[in-house]
């Protein structure tokens, strides 16, 4: 399977919420013993791979913003604490799965990533991430709505 | 914060079945893989196995004809049971949580168990 | 299984020197490998994982480097607390192994 990022790049209003999403793509083993979990944090991109570090989204780790299931099942976060912090994710049963950032500041800009790994619990963990960047500004340049971009080439959509 | 803690016999006879219980307090069981781990006198670090907070388990298979690890989520506690124990088998057992892709980032204090007669 | 080498098995240092702990895996785990440091009488306690990040809250003496099969752990300047077993890990797959401990004691 693979992870994609329908937008590299997401520009948004200060004070805007924004959806981060990723798209698990390809055969999903949905046998009793593969499971999936799925996360999000921040990273940079580094010297040896991005996503290699995983920094928390507005203090809260991958570990607290982590969604667990099997196959293509539903699934959300602890809600209380991510609602605290004006996030949430989310997973849908097509293989998508998305983090939700409200009331948007400059701190909020940078490299985000989601994680999938596969677990076959008698042979290994599969994993794969995807990566795209999130630009907040302020100002009279900035736009009055989120403009995303897609990730396979550089027209920009915006969302309203 | 998470905790982790060990709690059984710290003496077992040989040919007897190994029990302890990891009681989990501060976050949920319902995530993350959790762990027993082992570290005999003088020796390293042994993986023992695990259980999945749904129930798949997975073991080491140098012990695997002799373990079993369970669950019980509804008092947030995690057992392992190790059968016709010897002398081999004495160690300081650990319990720890193990975070898919990442480490085993959260360990009980370990409780030591002798098998002796 | 795979099994992981560490060397040395004891490493004398004096406090304020640096200390280099290696670990070689019998096969490539890519960089899929932690490490872990253990006082007497104490659980193990992460430092590093996917072989170059500091876990929460770990000083930035420590840092890890390598990938494939070859792995080495930095101590920059040693601190009295910092005398410890030091165990490697590797996580490609099951089961999950363990290298055989380097042990830093002072000099």
């Known amino acids: 399977f693979k992870v994609a990022t329908p937008y590299s790049l997401y520009v948004c209003p200060e004070g805007q919420q924004v959806t981060l999403t990723c798209r698990l793509l390809g055969p999903v083993d949905k046998g009793h013993d593969v499971t999936f979990y799925k996360t999000w944090y921040r990273s940079s991109r580094g010297e040896v791979q991005t996503c290699s570090e995983r920094r928390p989204i507005r203090q809260l780790t991958f570990q607290d913003l982590h969604l667990h299931h099997g196959g293509h099942q539903a699934a959300q976060t602890s809600h209380d604490l991510a609602q605290r912090h004006g996030l949430e994710s989310a997973s849908d049963h097509h293989g998508q799965f998305s983090i939700t950032m409200r009331n948007l500041t400059l701190l909020d800009s940078g490299l985000y990533c989601c994680l999938v790994v596969e677990i076959r619990h008698h042979h290994s963990e599969h994993r794969v991430h995807g990566a795209m960047e999130l630009q907040v500004q302020t100002g009279k340049d900035a736009p009055s709505n989120c403009v995303v971009y897609p990730s396979s080439s550089q027209d920009s959509e915006q969302i309203t | 914060q998470v905790q982790l803690q060990e709690s059984g016999p710290g003496l077992v006879k040989p040919s007897e079945t190994l029990s302890l219980t990891c009681t989990v307090s501060?976050?949920?069981?319902?995530?993350?893989?959790w762990s027993w781990i082992r570290k005999p006198p003088g020796k390293g670090l042994e993986w023992i196995g695990y259980?999945?907070?749904?129930?798949?388990?997975n073991y080491n298979p140098s012990l695997k004809s002799r373990v079993t690890i369970s669950v019980d989520t509804s008092k947030s506690q995690f057992s392992l049971k190790l059968s016709s124990v010897t002398a081999a088998d004495t160690a300081v057992y650990y319990c720890a949580r193990d975070i898919p892709a990442f480490a085993l980032d959260i360990w009980g204090q370990g409780t030591m168990v002798t098998v002796s007669s | 299984e795979i099994v992981l080498t560490q060397s040395p098995a004891t490493l004398s240092l004096s406090p304020g020197e640096r200390a280099t702990l290696s670990c070689r895996a019998s096969q490539s785990v890519s960089y899929y490998l932690a490490w872990y440091q253990q006082k007497p009488g104490q659980a193990p306690r992460l430092l590093i994982y996917?072989?170059?990040n500091r876990a929460t809250g770990i000083p930035a003496r420590f840092s890890g480097s390598g990938s494939g099969t070859d792995f080495t752990l930095t101590i920059s300047s040693l601190e009295p607390e910092d005398f410890a077993v030091y165990y490697c890990?590797?996580?490609?797959?099951?089961?999950?192994?363990f290298g055989g401990g380097t042990k830093v004691e002072i000099k």
């Open positions: 501060g976050g949920s069981i319902s995530s993350y893989y």
């Open positions: 259980i999945y907070y749904s129930g798949s388990t």
């Open positions: 890990q590797q996580r490609i797959n099951w089961p999950l192994t």
């Open positions: 996917d072989a170059f």
